[in-house]
């Protein structure tokens, strides 16, 4: 957002006055409450940046985004036999992606539309609580899932009821305490009527009295708590996992391991690099230089960090890839256009013919493998 | 080059409507709209209301009862009309050029028009 | 309501002198002021504006600095034209003009 400040003051997450309606006069509109943006933002919020640059990246993460979190659900839910601790973080990191990104048809067509937001100042609301909250939510079931994974490598020990409950008592938490923490985005007034541009905004401008200290106070929270303290979380856990595999013994089935829990920390790390760390960091300049300035110049590379942090929905899948063995199967056939089921029923034909005692312990019916860990 | 002209009836009886009319010349309307701005004789400067080129208005709240500022984009006019005049709007009334953005000052001005309104 | 209260109201000075016209804010505006002349039977005219930025075809003798709640226009050296009353104009918040100060022949 920009600032903008309303005339009774002017308005972009710009800043204004909260308390903004409106009436038609003839061809115009006569607004109680006037929300002035400065001409960059006014040029960023009618270029080709917001109008066409973001809702292709969001189509992008919508077409990707969708199916792909979507099967990843199914299967951690329903093809998934054994609910280990990662099966229930990835679960609810593909929950979470979807909660955003269904949402997401009516982004690509207010960029489309000039930025213009035609959909209620409820859907408004909703769209970016749970656009702020999927990056959140993001963050630490990844740093969950991270620390999960260097646990198993240190505690190879089986899969436990207790430890899955541990793992749902701990994503209930997440979910309240993004819920508690996205409350603010929700009581907001987040659509604010541009005069000048005669659009309607949603999240783009803000009142200034609310943005001038609370925004920044709020988001710089935010990047302390749910951003750099996990982010650190997972960077050791990363770190302390290469040196124990580093330092384990190198048969062909840890090899294996190895590549995979490598090309998982590499799909975090840009994750990190891409989604998260811009997004935060230019969350905390920007409401800075509002809150200092009185506006931002940094309100371009704000827009495109924010849309580029909704491409952790196209970069989870990948997390899922080199995490679950279930996934892998059902996303390679997928892909092939062919069902698990019938490669499971030619595994255990072939399987038959050569060993007709071991055959036994594959049931044609399972769709299930377990769960590489 | 950039011109605003304007004019209007320079007396008036009280209650009776305030009606003046901005020319603007050098500038497309797409991108400027006007404010107006009163200074009662001896005094300082208070602004009436504000007109986008799209026709959007914001109107002062201690005046905004009694304005309508409307503009014709064929004739590249804006106008004010101000009801229920007393002595207290005797003043001379001015249009200025905005760009309508926050950042943007009231670069261009018109002469002014001095109305009196007097029984 | 944002008050702007410009010091001193009148300001006596000889040609050549400095000139140092104050503006407050009664609160933070940034750098969303304006400073306009004013002569006896015209429209203002606008000299500087954002504070700082200097309008077309004003003359470099005329500076403007500040930001947040107080602002300064410096005329580095009076000449005759200059002698007028002086408005300051805040846009951060609505529109609200300073009630100007005369800069008169001493």
């Known amino acids: 957002t920009i600032q903008g400040t309303n005339r009774s003051s002017k308005g972009r997450s710009l800043i204004g006055k909260v308390d903004g309606t409106s009436h038609v006069t003839g061809k115009g509109v006569t607004v109680e409450t006037v929300f002035s943006v400065d001409e960059f933002s006014a040029s960023v919020l009618t270029g080709k940046l917001t109008t066409v640059f973001l809702p292709i990246v969001y189509t992008i993460v919508f077409v990707v985004g969708l199916p792909s979190n979507g099967m990843a659900l199914w299967v951690f839910l329903f093809r998934t036999k054994k609910k280990h601790p990662a099966v229930i973080y990835m679960a609810n990191l593909a929950l979470a992606d979807l909660l955003s990104v269904i949402w997401f048809p009516l982004k690509i067509a207010y960029h489309i539309h000039g930025n213009n937001w035609i959909y209620g100042e409820a859907l408004c609301n909703v769209l970016i609580g749970f656009f702020y909250g999927n990056m959140y939510c993001s963050i630490l079931f990844m740093t969950c899932l991270s620390v999960q994974r260097y646990w198993v490598i240190v505690n190879p020990m089986g899969h436990s009821r207790k430890k899955a409950n541990i793992a749902i008592g701990i994503s209930l938490a997440i979910w309240l305490l993004i819920l508690l923490v996205t409350i603010p985005l929700y009581v907001v007034k987040q659509t604010i009527f541009i005069p000048a541009l005669n659009i309607t905004t949603c999240h783009d401008v803000l009142p200034e009295q609310l943005l001038v200290g609370d925004m920044f106070n709020y988001f710089l929270s935010l990047a302390i708590g749910v951003f750099l303290f996990p982010a650190f979380l997972t960077a050791s856990a990363y770190v302390l996992m290469i040196r124990m595999l580093r330092s384990s013994a190198m048969d062909e089935n840890s090899e294996k391991k190895r590549k995979r829990a490598i090309k998982l920390i590499v799909t975090v790390l840009a994750m990190y690099l891409i989604c998260f760390t811009p997004s935060n960091l230019l969350l905390v300049v920007h409401y800075f230089l509002i809150k200092s300035q009185g506006q931002s110049h940094v309100y371009a590379l704000y827009i495109v960090a924010l849309c580029l942090s909704t491409l952790n929905s196209c970069i989870d899948p990948f997390v899922y890839y080199f995490v679950s063995h279930d996934f892998r199967d059902h996303a390679k056939n997928a892909l092939l256009c062919r069902s698990v089921r019938t490669v499971k029923q030619m595994q255990v034909s072939l399987t038959s013919k050569k060993h007709s005692r071991k055959s036994s312990s594959y049931s044609s019916s399972s769709t299930t493998v377990k769960t590489s860990y | 080059q950039v011109q605003l002209q304007q004019w209007g009836a320079g007396l008036l009886k009280p209650s009776e409507t305030l009606s003046l009319t901005c020319a603007v010349y050098?500038?497309?309307?797409?991108?400027?709209?006007v404010i107006w701005i009163r200074q009662p004789p001896g005094k300082g400067l208070e602004w009436i209301g504000v007109?986008?080129?799209?026709?959007?208005?914001y109107y002062n709240p201690s005046l905004k009862s009694r304005v309508t500022i409307s503009v014709d984009t064929s004739k590249n006019q804006f106008s004010l009309k101000l009801s229920s005049v007393t002595a207290a709007d005797t003043a001379v009334y001015y249009c200025?050029?905005?760009?309508?953005?926050?950042?943007?000052?009231?670069?261009?001005w018109g002469q002014g028009t001095l109305v009196t309104v007097s029984s | 309501e944002i008050v702007l209260t410009q010091s001193p109201a009148t300001l006596s000075l000889s040609p050549g002198e400095r000139a140092t016209l104050s503006c407050k804010a009664s609160?933070?505006?940034?750098?969303?002021l304006d400073w306009y002349q004013q002569k006896p039977g015209q429209a203002p005219r606008l000299l500087i504006y954002n504070t700082n930025s200097l309008h077309t075809g004003i003359p470099a003798r005329f500076s403007g600095s500040g930001s947040g709640r107080d602002f300064t226009l410096t005329i580095s050296s009076l000449e005759p034209e200059d002698f007028a009353v002086y408005y300051c104009l805040q846009h951060n918040s609505g529109w609200t003009f300073g009630g100007g100060t005369k800069v008169e022949i001493k």
């Open positions: 609160q933070n505006i940034y750098k969303y």
């Open positions: 200025a050029r905005w760009r309508g953005y926050k950042d943007y000052p009231f670069d261009y």
């Open positions: 050098g500038f497309s309307l797409n991108s400027y709209g």
């Open positions: 007109i986008w080129g799209n026709g959007n208005t």
